[in-house]
């Protein structure tokens, strides 16, 4: 007859740590010693004839064990599994690119350490709550990875990984652990650089505004730019509009960056970097000024009229060019009555890279001169007739500009000049009329002769 | 009829190890328990451990953990037992005995193998 | 691990005497084991299960006690008795032995 020796229960399942009671029992008739063959740690708990009870205690792993006890001469054997299972202690997913190209792939990898039993741990890997790989944990630790086509839609998006510990065949449920999500930053970055508008010419110590823009920009509004008139970077402002980012600026030329220079604009995203330069001259441009030896004139006194401007810049004073750029124009007269009120214009040129930069100014001149009244303008002997209305057409000149008055011979009656009037034959007679100013008289004789009105 | 033959004395020097045989006949090796014991000269026993030549199991006593491993070939019929790491304290008569069931304890022993450890 | 104590540790005795032996354990025990080793020789099974002479054993042994307590008898002794005298017990790892007792000729 063969005798049995059972082994209760049979292959248990537990929790990692935990202790088990196992029995250990024959049928064979016989007051033998059961041992129990395990390397876990034990204790008997009871015996008797044909039977021993033990208690395993801080069971860990996977184990074997096995009952013996002899029999009418021969050994018997009884054996059970022990199935231990375990929460992974650590379940992460690896770092991710801190910036992924869209359109390019990158690699998930999530590291699983500890879990049991292995054959019923799974690991998936999610994009929000979309599984993108399921894959069994094999190795310790147990590292998974799925590769993912970045897409701007996964900006900004969670990944994690989460196991899953499945002993519900066994009636204990479905243990989950998920990693700390980690959130992905995707861009796009065009190989074309950006669109950089900005003056050929600056001239020193004035502004002018900069544009740069750059198309199919994603996410633009994490894009960095970086404008810069040479060294001196420039406070730009920027905006977005969809997938074009605009950086506005306005550069200011000191005098210390007087010559060849370039205006750089940066953008960057995703750690990589787009760059457009412009070539700019930044110029000085003084001038040109002209100047009066006497702004305000004796008439026959000398002036001397002359121009400048900068260095490089070509000086010409009312159609006299100046010796060489950067020098004075000048020229020489003696003030006349006809030099009063006389513009003196002086145009300046400044080539800058083959471009030539015109500019003009004029001064104007004052001539102190006497009272005169020119004859041509007023008729020293006029015919009228009573009672028709008439303008006496004088005019006075001179600087500084002379009282007009007309007085009748004899008399304090005064003709008003320029201003119309009616005339009768109270008017007829001689006149002076005298121009008057701080340098002096200047008189003339009007004679005015009045025809009577005939009533026939 | 049971006997166990065991090997012949051992001479070492500190820090060596030993392996000694203990070859059953007259009997099925691998139904029973094989034990091995101590005695140290003009002292009493000392349980070191025993293997199921069956399973190849092993227990030891807490002491000998670290000094004894139990070995056995089912082919030859032959439980062997190494010792390492030797010092004077293990120069001393070892024994293997069969543990023949409750009923009948350790029922044959081997003549003994001695250990003597000398520099 | 359980204590085996036997007493006394050494006796003389005289061919023909009854001599006891005994044995405490250190907690209780289901049955134990007698030996007994003569000089330069293995130990050889006296007694098992507590009273049960092994094959081959004079009838003058005897074996008692239950519990913590147990007694080895030798009802008269003969020449060949002289020798050491071991309990052994296997309740739980590890096996132990007492120290022995040394029965020696008056």
């Known amino acids: 007859q063969e005798f049995l020796l059972r082994v209760e229960p049979q292959n248990p399942v537990l929790s990692a740590g935990g202790s088990l009671f196992v029995n250990c029992s024959t049928d064979c008739p016989s007051s033998e010693k059961i041992a129990l063959e395990t390397s876990l740690s034990k204790e008997l708990v009871a015996s008797g004839m044909g039977w021993a009870a033990f208690n395993l205690s801080n069971v860990t792993g996977n184990s074997r064990i096995l009952c013996s006890v002899y029999c009418n001469g021969s050994q018997i054997t009884g054996s059970s599994n022990i199935t231990v299972y375990g929460l992974p202690e650590r379940v992460e997913l690896a770092p991710l690119p801190p910036w992924q190209p869209v359109g390019q792939n990158f690699t998930l990898r999530c590291q699983v350490e500890g879990g049991s039993p292995r054959t019923s741990l799974t690991v998936v890997l999610l994009r929000w709550e979309e599984e993108l790989s399921r894959q069994p944990a094999v190795e310790e630790p147990a590292e998974v990875t799925a590769t993912v086509l970045a897409s701007r839609d996964d900006h900004g998006a969670p990944f994690s990984c989460r196991t899953e510990l499945d002993m519900q065949p066994q009636g204990l449920g479905l243990f989950v652990n998920t990693s700390a999500p980690r959130q992905l930053r995707t861009f796009v970055l065009p190989v074309t650089p950006p669109r950089l508008v900005a003056p050929r010419f600056l001239e020193v110590e004035t502004s002018w505004p900069v544009d740069c823009t750059l198309d199919g920009l994603f996410p633009a509004s994490e894009a960095q730019v970086y404008l810069a008139l040479g060294d001196q970077m420039l406070n730009a402002t920027v905006m977005n509009h969809g997938d074009t980012l605009t950086a506005t600026a306005t550069a200011t030329a000191r005098a210390d960056q007087e010559g060849a220079r370039e205006i750089v604009c940066n953008v960057t995203l995703g750690g990589e970097r787009r760059e457009a330069r412009e070539n700019l001259t930044v110029f000085s441009f003084l001038g040109p000024i002209v100047n009066l030896s006497e702004p305000t004139a004796h008439e026959g006194s000398t002036v001397t009229v002359s121009c400048m401007a900068g260095a490089r810049v070509q000086v010409t004073l009312d159609g006299v060019p100046a010796a060489a750029p950067g020098q004075t124009a000048q020229l020489q007269l003696n003030a006349t009555e006809s030099d009063d009120g006389r513009s003196f214009f002086c145009s300046a040129t400044l080539e800058v890279d083959g471009e030539f930069l015109h500019r003009n100014s004029s001064v104007q001149l004052r001539v102190l001169y006497g009272p005169k009244i020119d004859r041509a303008t007023c008729p020293q002997h006029l015919k009228w007739k009573d009672k028709t209305r008439h303008v006496l057409q004088c005019q006075a000149r001179g600087n500084p500009y002379p009282e007009l008055r007309c007085l009748k011979e004899g008399s304090s009656r005064e003709v008003p000049v320029g201003i119309p009037f009616f005339v009768n034959v109270t008017h007829n007679g001689t006149y002076q009329c005298q121009a008057s100013s701080s340098r002096g008289k200047y008189t003339l004789v009007v004679v005015m002769d009045i025809e009577a009105f005939s009533s026939h | 009829q049971v006997q166990l033959q065991q090997s012949g004395a051992e001479l070492a020097k500190p820090g060596a190890s030993v392996k000694m045989s203990c070859k059953a006949s007259?009997?099925?090796?691998?139904?029973?328990?094989m034990h091995w014991v101590k005695q140290r000269p003009g002292q009493g026993l000392e349980w070191i451990g025993y293997?199921?030549?069956?399973?190849?199991?092993?227990e030891y006593n807490q002491r000998f953990q670290d000094k004894a491993t139990l070995t056995a070939d089912k082919s030859s019929s032959t439980a062997y037992m190494q010792l390492s790491s030797l010092t004077s304290e293990d120069s001393a008569v070892y024994y293997c005995?069969?543990?023949?069931?409750?009923?009948?304890?350790?029922?044959?022993w081997g003549q003994g193998t001695s250990v003597t450890v000398s520099s | 691990d359980i204590q085996m104590t036997q007493s006394p540790s050494s006796l003389s005795a005289s061919v023909g005497d009854r001599v006891t032996i005994t044995c405490s354990a250190s907690?209780?025990?289901?049955?134990i084991y007698w030996y007994q080793q003569k000089p330069g020789k293995a130990p050889k099974l006296l007694i098992y299960?507590?009273?049960n002479l092994a094959s081959g054993v004079p009838s003058r042994f005897s074996g008692s006690g239950s519990g913590t307590d147990f007694t080895l008898t030798i009802s008269s002794l003969q020449p060949e008795d002289f020798a050491t005298y071991y309990c052994q017990q296997w309740k739980s790892i590890p096996l132990t032995f007492g120290q022995g007792t040394k029965l020696e000729i008056k």
């Open positions: 907690s209780s025990v289901s049955y």
């Open positions: 005995a069969r543990w023949g069931g409750n009923s009948y304890g350790l029922d044959y």
């Open positions: 293997i199921n030549p069956n399973t190849d199991y092993t």
């Open positions: 007259g009997y099925t090796f691998t139904v029973y328990w």
């Open positions: 299960l507590t009273s």
